[in-house]
């Protein structure tokens, strides 16, 4: 999950495996101030999971979340 520094969440590692799409309710991008670009998925249990925006499954999930 993202690490908060001065209220700016940043990610230092990414989840490798795809999360179940049905478990994800929203997402956000971390700040450009962070050293690693990341997408943070928020699960239906309100857990935050860092993901690599370059991964295919991450892009696919973002697209589907944008459409829903």
């Amino acid at each position: 999950s993202p690490y908060s520094s001065d209220t700016t969440p940043c990610c230092f590692a990414y989840i490798a495996r795809p999360l179940p799409r049905a478990h994800i309710k929203e997402y956000f991008y971390t700040s450009g101030k962070c050293s690693n670009p990341a997408v943070v998925f928020v699960t239906r249990k309100n857990r935050q999971v860092c993901a690599n925006p370059e991964k295919k499954w991450v892009r696919e999930y973002i697209n589907s979340l944008e459409m829903s």
Epitope: Y14, L19, H23, K55, W57, E60, Y61, S64
Partner: antibody
Amino acid sequence: QVQLVQSGAEVKKPGASVKVSCKVSGYTLNDFAMHWVRQAPGKGLEWMGGYVPEDGDTIYAQKFQGRVTMTEDTSTDTAYMELSSLRSEDTAVYYCATDYLYIPSLSYWGQGTTVTVSS
Amino acid sequence: SYVLTQPPSVSVAPGQTARITCGGNNIESKSVHWYQQKPGQAPVLVVYDDSDRPSGIPERFSGSNSGNTATLTISRVEAGDEADYYCQVWDSNTDHWVFGGGTKVTVL
């Protein structure tokens, strides 16, 4: 060294249940996703379901929904797969498998447990 | 649900190149993983994320993914490469891992 060691072969009668265990060593069970895959004699691999540690949930393949239960005992680093209402078509080798570190697929596998369903 | 189609068998002479295909609708939009399974043994991951190799897997194993077909290529085939090979993807529509039917590689 990551290792997954499964319980021994089982012979069951139709209608019975079977519970297969998978003991992990070399890492902590709740850090990674444990999945179960089966292979009927002479057939291909079939995913049954798995644990999602990030959300504390287990997901099951639709085909097995309601008939399979996957659990984990983190105190002993052992995962379990229980399949109920067994039929002859459930005769197969059952594998536990897990991802590990930065690899998004099933990097480590148990040796397999043969389950035979016969009257 | 998502369907992966593999040829049942591929034959190749030692030292030659084996190509194993895995077909699926717009499969290039998915990450494909490949497993090798020898008789009586558990599967072994040989390629993940289309073309990456886990440590310990020889460079002779490589993968590609374009259009509706992903391919596992085994260069300079050896007798020890004789096995069944399975492709796998994550289907986000069903939240299921999906395997192809498998391809038996025979080294002549």
